[in-house]
């Protein structure tokens, strides 16, 4: 297993609709064709997997049907969006990138993006 640098923003504020987006960029040492991206949440010293997707370079990210994440890729950048967030979901969201194929296997873990979520009052006759 070889190490790889992963960069992500330090702080993101979720929208009033509970949507947060951030870019996860990795320094690919080679020409990977298959990449796996995992979003981990760290809060109260507990780490849980939020979502994960494997994609072939040049193709769309494919998350599970019931995933709360969506994303797109462009070169060595992955644009991740998490939806349905509320105040209790505030925490550090860590981007983990694995270059699965071809060998050698590379692993990179970002420092995390602190996502802040506020529960707003709904506006009259609207969805926030």
């Amino acid at each position: 297993c070889k190490a790889m640098h992963v960069a992500q923003p330090a702080v993101v504020l979720a929208s009033s609709r509970g949507i947060a987006s951030f870019v996860c960029e990795y320094a690919s040492p080679g020409k990977a064709t298959e990449v796996r991206v995992t979003v981990l949440r760290q809060a109260d010293s507990q780490v849980t997997e939020v979502c994960a997707a494997t994609y072939m370079m040049g193709n769309e990210l494919t998350f599970l049907d019931d995933s709360i994440c969506t994303g797109t890729s462009s070169g060595n950048q992955v644009n991740l969006t998490i939806q349905g967030l509320r105040a209790m979901d505030t925490g550090l969201y860590i981007c983990k990138v694995e270059l699965m194929y071809p060998p050698p296997y590379y692993l990179g873990i970002g420092n995390g993006t602190q996502i802040y979520v506020i529960d707003p009052e709904p506006c009259p006759d609207s969805d926030f």
């Epitope: 939020v50 019931d66 939806q83 349905g84 967030l85 105040a87 209790m88 529960d119 926030f128």
Partner: antibody, heavy 123, light 107 residues
Framework: QVQLVQSGAEVKKPGASVKVSCKAS????????IHWVRQAPGQGLEWMGI????????ISAQKFQGRVTMTSDTSTSTVSMELSSLRSDDTAVYYC????????????????WGQGTLVTVSS | DIQLTQSPSSLSASVGDRVTITCRVS??????LNWYRQKPGEIPKLLIY???SLQSGVPSRFSGSGSGTDFTLTISSLQPEDIATYYC?????????FGQGTKLEIK
Amino acid sequence: QVQLVQSGAEVKKPGASVKVSCKASGFTFTSYYIHWVRQAPGQGLEWMGIINPSGGSTISAQKFQGRVTMTSDTSTSTVSMELSSLRSDDTAVYYCARDPPITMVRDAPFDYWGQGTLVTVSS
Amino acid sequence: DIQLTQSPSSLSASVGDRVTITCRVSQDISRLLNWYRQKPGEIPKLLIYRASSLQSGVPSRFSGSGSGTDFTLTISSLQPEDIATYYCQRTYSAPYTFGQGTKLEIK
């Protein structure tokens, strides 16, 4: 095991207030939102509001704003819902239900409900 | 206001039938939708969450699909105990509105 136990049935007069409580056990009370839902006799489900027990922040449906007050007591793992200025059409069964943060992916929203509290408003 | 419209409002089907109930939402809610079954005199029971995830302990004859604004609950083979009213609910954000319900009866 996870339980939400609600207070007993109430009979109130129009214009009065009612307070329904929901005591949680079997899970970390401050890690889940609690919703209030009501159901009038023979009618559908109606969402009333949500409370974050850890901070006490609330959101209520527009229809109930100004009339509903939701509170939490972390020392007893209890949330309460008070509805004021009662009318006959507030006669309903009132339910509480828990709801995890969405990133708690192993738990489903509204997976556990209280047994319901019948509130009858009659002169 | 955000509207959830279920169709049909009532339906009658035979044991073993495939039954489909639809829920249309007035705004895009991605996949954040629940389905419930409520038998007479009982509390609502969660069947499906996030549009297609089967809640633990729920029979596999129940399935959900859809995203955005159009969702479907399917019972692959109707059983006598499925006599109930079915509700959809958006869990995207407040208000966590319910559909008006679909009353299912056995022929």
